[in-house]
């Protein structure tokens, strides 16, 4: 999307609404770079493949992202 | 009650600038993408600009690129919009309005919560 | 630059009946990126649609919304009276980035 911007971050706004893991497609955990100063946290929901952006310092996002790790740490051999 | 209140509207000289702002209340307004969008007098919405959650995102439309300045300050839930050389178009009502929770540039929620609106005239 | 065309221009209908209103766009747009808008003369619009067809908190089932590439549809599914009022679709995307219809007035016949 052609947003006349100066840096290239991803995110409008951010939720600090919890997120069931259960409902996640996929999350995906963008670190600062040249072009966005900041963590960019964007979680995919399963339902209408919707993308939400999430708050990195909200207490509720710091958990799952604990969560979604411990599982991918469970899964991985 | 989440509330969002425009103020700075008056009457102005075309050639002149006029500052609006708009005062959040009732919610963490670092945490949200915002926007001004603009009525003319019998006419239907017209967006003008809008700014990311940390202020680096900022887009305008074609029609004030180059004129309106767009800004905010998190410490003071403030969003503002500078307007220099005012036209006689440039005459409407200017809303603020906050962009959904967790908008992106691959989704949109949409504006859900919009100001009552400050009117702008632009007249000699 | 994507157009946004509504129709039609304004809509006759009776309590009780049920309303389509059509948005079309110049380019297709992602299903993502399309939003309907309710305003009521002197009062600010309120967000009724965003993702084209996912409703806003608060906002009654019989409001629902359709479509994809350059066809949306609003529907009303039995219009109350305070359902008088205009509506608008809404693209983000394209420069310039947020574009709005121009909009359909719902009145009493």
């Known amino acids: 999307i052609p947003l006349s911007r100066t840096v290239r971050c991803t995110c409008i706004s951010i939720s600090n609404q919890p997120v069931n893991p259960r409902s996640l497609e996929k999350l995906e955990i963008i670190p600062p770079s040249q072009f966005c100063p900041h963590v960019e946290i964007i979680a995919t929901m399963k339902k209408k493949g919707e993308k939400r952006c999430l708050n990195p310092e909200s207490k509720a996002i710091k958990n799952l992202l604990k969560a979604v790790s411990k599982e991918r740490s469970k899964r991985s051999p | 009650q989440v509330q969002l209140v425009e103020s700075g509207g008056g009457v102005v000289q075309p050639g002149r600038s006029l500052r609006l702002s708009c005062t959040a209340s009732g919610f963490t307004f670092s945490d949200y993408g915002m926007h001004w969008v603009r009525q003319a007098p019998g006419k239907g919405l017209e967006w003008v600009a809008v700014i990311g959650y940390g202020g680096l995102i900022k887009g305008y439309a074609d029609s004030v690129k180059g004129r309106f300045t767009i800004s905010r300050d998190n410490s003071k839930n403030t969003l503002y919009l500078q307007m220099n050389s005012l036209r006689a178009e440039d005459t409407a009502v200017y809303y603020c309005?906050?962009?959904?929770?967790?908008?992106?540039?691959?989704?949109?929620?949409?504006?859900?919560?919009w100001g009552q609106g400050t009117t702008v005239t632009v007249s000699s | 630059e994507i157009v946004l065309t509504q129709s039609p221009g304004t809509l006759s209908l009776s309590p009780g009946e049920r309303a389509t209103l059509s948005c079309r766009a110049s380019?297709?747009?992602?299903?993502?990126?399309l939003a309907w808008y309710q305003q009521k003369p002197g009062q600010a619009p309120r967000l009724l649609i965003y993702g084209a067809s996912s409703r806003a908190t608060g906002i009654p089932d019989r409001f629902s919304g359709s479509g994809s590439g350059t066809d949306f549809t609003l529907t009303i599914s039995r219009l109350e009276p305070e359902d008088f009022a205009v509506y608008y679709c809404?693209?983000?995307?394209?420069?310039?980035?947020?574009?709005f219809g121009p909009g359909t007035k719902v009145d009493i016949k």
């Open positions: 809404q693209q983000y995307g394209s420069s310039p980035i947020f574009t």
């Open positions: 309005a906050r962009e959904g929770a967790g908008s992106s540039v691959y989704y949109y929620y949409g504006m859900d919560v």
């Open positions: 380019q297709s747009v992602s299903s993502s990126y």
